[in-house]
């Protein structure tokens, strides 16, 4: 979706020798790394599905779009793309599906034009807090990143470190306040159970936020108030049960917002009344007529928009003396 694209103009392919061979000399302007295809006209280099274990050292200085997908990179060290002269034009970098499990501090340093970065479909067990900021200063130099695509970067359960995966990702997003200019953030399919409460407040430029296909149960402690530029919020395929008044008011007040809520297990009891009232009048929810109840059983598959207050009841809590064992 947001990964770098290239035109289909003349790709030259290099001889198939090992890409890990380090060249002491700066690369020739028209040189193409082994196992890659290059198009100077399109400013694009593609090293796709070649089982590379390292980032090629001899990338041409003209590269603007770099595809390193479907490889076996494992680790992205500090300065993985630092070159002399620097890759000053590199704007879009796609590393998806390259078996990365570790991204170290400063991995993307010396890429002054990097606007799009896609790390999707890598089992990132170890994402340094300083992966994107490059330094451990409390305020780093602003990152040029505008789009950060981190879909399906959750490692398998047995490979996770003894810490919160959500916390690890958020630490990298917030370090040094480097990503203040970020406009698109995709975090789909990461088994997120919660969203740390401070993350959105520190990404004020966000236009597009994709949190779909996670396990978010509640947004009670998440504030959208400061995201005045937010245009799309994808919350499909989570575990949301209800949205409460505070969240509804914040979403309703955002001037550009479109919200996507499909395929959540909505609980249609008395706590749902405010949300149903809101849904009936709001225009910000896309496809709101598709939202259906999952619980309680008697309400399953009922359309939220068709419910009225009489449908939304809560079973009374019996006093202890009336409860049966």
């Amino acid at each position: 979706s947001s990964s770098p694209t290239s035109s289909a103009s003349s790709f030259s392919s290099s001889a198939p020798f090992l890409a890990s061979a380090v060249s002491a000399q700066p690369p020739l302007p028209d040189q193409c790394p082994a196992l890659c295809e290059c198009s100077e006209a399109a400013r694009t280099v593609k090293c796709v599905n070649r089982n590379l274990t390292e980032v090629p050292t001899d990338l041409p200085a003209y590269v603007r779009n770099l595809f390193l997908t479907g490889n076996q990179l494992a680790v992205l060290p500090a300065g993985a793309f630092a070159r002399r002269p620097p890759l000053a034009e590199l704007a879009a970098l796609n590393l998806s599906g390259s078996r990365l499990d570790e991204v170290r501090a400063g991995a993307f340093e010396h890429l002054p034009s990097l606007r799009q970065l896609d790390l999707s479909h890598n089992p990132l067990a170890d994402l340094s807090p300083f992966a994107f900021s490059g330094s451990n200063a409390s305020v780093s130099a602003p990152s040029p990143l505008v789009e950060l695509i981190l879909n399906h970067i959750v490692p398998p359960e047995d490979e996770r470190q003894n810490r919160s995966f959500e916390g690890m990702v958020v630490a990298a997003l917030l370090a040094g306040r480097a990503l203040q200019g970020l406009r698109r953030l995709e975090l789909a399919s990461n088994h997120f159970l919660y969203l740390p409460r401070d993350v959105l407040a520190q990404l004020p430029s966000l236009r597009h936020l994709d949190l779909s296909n996670n396990s978010l149960v509640s947004l009670t402690y998440v504030s959208f108030r400061n995201l005045t530029h937010l245009e799309s919020l994808h919350l499909e395929d989570n575990a949301l049960k209800v949205l409460h008044n505070g969240t509804l008011a914040e979403l309703q007040g955002l001037p550009h917002i479109r919200v996507f809520l499909d395929n959540n297990p909505w609980v249609c009891d008395c706590h749902m009344a405010d949300m149903v009232t809101w849904l009936k009048e709001t225009e910000v929810v896309q496809g709101k007529d598709r939202l259906t109840c999952a619980y309680p059983e008697k309400m399953r598959n009922r359309v939220l928009l068709e419910l009225n207050s009489a449908d939304l009841d809560c079973d009374p809590i019996l006093p202890p003396s009336l409860q049966t064992s």
Epitope: L248, A249, P255, H256, R258, E283
Partner: antibody, heavy 122, light 111 residues
């Protein structure tokens, strides 16, 4: 740059029909609600209706004053908004504007076309 | 339908002074904490131009001389200091309920 250009206005007899078009550019047309508003000479603005975006099924809402006579539609492949006007009356004479709703449609219209003039007279 | 009553119908203000235009709604235009009331400026032969949305948010590119206030049913547009370029018609609009409705307009002139 967002641009809206209306066309199709002109002189029509009472009881006649007219179709107005609005060519949109500079934004993702299918993401936005679109609207028609009219203004008789020297008078206030009157909202005629809107058509929703792709996410909300391109359904329409119309003002009671034109319901049954005016129809709003859109050609999303060409980014064109239409207003089909039937059974026209003298009081329908006005400048007709097409307008784009903000991303959150509750905040109403942020961009307007220059308008096209419709005169209903025998 | 929600009726918007705008007053005064016309207003003459000296350059550099403050102009205040009011708009009253027949029922609340608030929805989940936001008042969905806009202000537009219209010059002769031109389409309306959005100045203020959500009662008090100044549209991008609009001079800071323009401000909006109010909530529920009572709203005002303030221009200070008034400049020659501000000579125009001003309309309020509610988008809380369908049909959206406009006020009758206020004509701003220079004294």
């Amino acid at each position: 740059e967002v641009k809206l250009v209306e066309s199709g206005g002109g002189l029509v007899q009472p009881g006649g029909s007219l179709s107005l078009s609005c060519a949109a550019s500079g934004f993702t047309f299918t993401d936005y609600y679109m609207s028609w508003v009219r203004q008789p000479p020297g008078k206030a603005l009157e909202w005629l209706g809107f058509i929703r975006n792709k996410g909300n099924g391109y359904t329409t809402e119309n003002s009671a004053s034109v319901k049954g006579r005016f129809t709003i539609s859109r050609d999303n492949s060409q980014s064109i908004l239409y207003l089909q006007m039937n059974a026209l009356r003298a009081e329908d004479s006005a400048t007709y504007y097409c307008a784009r709703y903000r991303g959150n449609p509750h905040y109403a219209m942020d961009y307007w076309g220059q308008g096209t003039s419709v005169t209903v007279s025998s | 339908d929600i009726v918007l009553t705008q007053f005064p119908a016309s207003l003459a203000v000296s350059l550099g002074q403050r102009a205040t235009i009011s708009c009253r709604a027949s029922e609340s235009v608030e929805f989940y904490g936001t008042s969905f009331l806009q202000w537009y400026q219209q010059k002769p032969g031109q389409p309306p131009k959005l100045l203020i949305y959500g009662a008090s948010n100044v549209e991008s590119g609009v001079p800071a001389r323009f401000s909006g206030s109010g909530s529920g049913t009572d709203f005002s547009l303030s221009i200070h200091p008034v400049e020659e370029d501000d000579i125009a018609m001003y309309f309020c609009q509610q988008s809380r309920k369908v049909p959206s409705t406009f006020g009758g307009g206020t004509k701003l002139e220079i004294k």
